[in-house]
């Protein structure tokens, strides 16, 4: 595969997955009730990072918001915490690698910082699928905690209303924005190594400068009448460089290993 | 104005069935759902079951499954129940009431009787 | 199914009189998702179809006076007129809309004195 094509498509991939993080951390079916093994009920239940609704046989849907943060369960603060992380990271993965993007040219940015940019976000992007993959892994978690612990507490007759009635205990199971969060954190996961891949592609290696050595008659001077910069496409480098002292080469793709992330 | 306009009374034979109607006016009769409830004379109220006109979802009472059916007509907004192998335990007047906020009933219509005689 | 036990069965009352109709149920009928009562409240006049009163367990229907009041939680439901007018007299049901199937309570009859 090309490197444009592995950029272009590790750029690709990492957008989807981002925009399914996002949609993930937005959605409100991060736990939804259990419906298996229980009474049915004429209200579903589901719940979200930021809001939690009822759903009525009726149809009418009614979503509180959590409107306290002292009041929340750490773990679920935690997630919500991870989620907006891999979102800030994945927003800036974005933007860098649009600048990074081999079939974007912008001013006289060359390989060397691209393949910087191309890493940066590529890394940015690793982070933020692992974010949401822990975010949405250690929400689960905790549902299959509480719903072991609320399916040994079924109808005791402590079941939250006291006495010795019959209570119906909400057990609460996967929703859907889980398996979205799961699947999108992975692909800008694979989006971000494939961007890493593709800087890899764009790197140079500069213990081969190859050029063209002309012998002008008279002198036995080596000059490199100026070469162009291979892959920018932006002006040309005129300047005559003396040859190496390893007889006639030919200049291919001129560049210098990124020696820091320099990018704005 | 909600209204619910039941058919008119039935006598019917024993073994026989009936189907009466409620036709819907003053709302978007796909957006509710309508229930189905039996009241037989000088007695309580019995829920039979509801059907959702926008996808002809429906939810019965176990008693009534097997002896009431229940479909909608969304082009003339009207919904349907049709009661089967009658005895004289059917006789009642049955009410279509539209399902509410909080899963309250907050419209009904006038009731159909029915009178199971041979 | 879940059983809806209405008392008194019949209530004799005078006008203006205090009243109030007691609803127990089976099983808990509160909701942990939204902490509401998944309980209703209808009355019903002689060749009449039901009137939604109370949903919720205490959410007043719009166009009900607001005599009426629904309280209670759980398993223990009441229904309070707290000044009873002629027109008040009729059988009031309750209902659990929470688990299906849906059921009524037998109803309590308010009779004037």
């Known amino acids: 595969m090309s490197v444009t094509a592995c950029q272009g498509l590790g750029f690709v991939v990492s957008l989807i997955g981002f925009a399914g993080i996002i949609a993930a951390t937005c959605m409100d079916q991060w736990s939804t009730q259990d419906l298996y093994n229980n009474p049915v009920t004429a209200v579903f239940n589901y719940q979200g990072l930021w809001r939690s609704c009822v759903r009525e046989s009726s149809g009418f849907t009614e979503c509180r918001g959590y409107f306290t943060l002292l009041g929340l369960p750490a773990m679920l603060q935690a997630v919500r915490a991870l989620m907006i992380v891999g979102i800030v990271l994945g927003v800036i993965g974005i933007l860098v690698s649009i600048f990074a993007l081999k079939c974007i040219r912008i001013g006289s940015m060359d390989d060397s910082a691209k393949a910087k940019m191309t890493l940066t976000s590529g890394i940015l992007f690793i982070i933020s699928g692992i974010c949401a993959i822990i975010g949405v892994s250690v929400f689960a978690n905790m549902l299959v905690t509480n719903f072991w612990m609320s399916t040994a507490n079924m109808y005791s007759g402590m079941g939250g209303m006291g006495g010795m009635v019959q209570t119906v205990q909400t057990r609460y199971t996967f929703g859907a924005a889980l398996f979205v969060g799961w699947v999108a954190g992975g692909l800008t996961l694979i989006g971000g190594v494939m961007m890493c891949i593709a800087c890899r592609g764009l790197t140079p290696d500069d213990s081969n400068f190859k050029a063209v050595s002309y012998h002008a008659s008279g002198q036995n001077v080596a000059y490199r009448p100026g070469g162009f910069k291979a892959s920018t496409g932006f002006g040309s480098n005129t300047r005559n460089k003396k040859i190496y002292d390893g007889g006639a080469r030919t200049e291919d793709d001129e560049q210098s290993h990124p020696t820091k992330y320099d990018y704005v | 104005e909600v209204q619910l306009q039941q058919s008119g009374p039935e006598l019917v034979k024993p073994g026989a069935s009936v189907k009466m109607s409620c036709k819907a006016s003053?709302?978007?009769?796909?957006?509710?759902?309508m229930n189905w409830v039996k009241q037989k004379p000088g007695q309580g109220l019995e829920w039979i079951g509801y059907i959702n006109p926008y996808n002809d979802g429906t939810k019965y009472n176990e008693r009534f499954k097997g002896k009431a059916t229940l479909t909608s007509d969304k082009s003339s907004s009207t919904a349907f129940m049709e009661v089967s192998s009658l005895t004289s335990e059917d006789s009642a007047v049955y009410y279509c009431?539209?399902?509410?906020?909080?899963?309250?009933?907050?419209?009904w219509g006038q009731g159909t009787s029915v009178t199971v005689s041979s | 199914d879940i059983v809806m036990t209405q008392s008194p069965s019949s209530l004799t009352v005078t006008v203006r009189e205090k009243v109030t109709l007691s609803c127990k149920s089976s099983?808990?009928?509160?909701?942990?998702?939204?902490?509401?009562?998944?309980l209703t409240w209808y009355q019903q006049k002689p060749g009449q179809p039901p009137k939604l009163l109370i949903y919720?367990?205490?959410t007043r229907e719009s166009g009900v006076p607001d005599r009426f009041t629904g309280s209670g939680s759980g398993t223990d439901f009441t229904l309070t007129i707290s000044s009873v007018q002629a027109e008040d007299l009729a059988v009031y049901y309750c209902q659990n809309v929470y688990i299906y199937p849906f059921t009524f309570g037998a109803g309590t009859k308010l009779e004037l004195k």
């Open positions: 003053g709302y978007t009769f796909t957006n509710y759902v």
């Open positions: 919720w367990a205490s």
């Open positions: 099983q808990s009928l509160l909701n942990s998702g939204n902490q509401k009562n998944y």
């Open positions: 009431a539209r399902l509410y906020r909080g899963n309250a009933m907050d419209y």
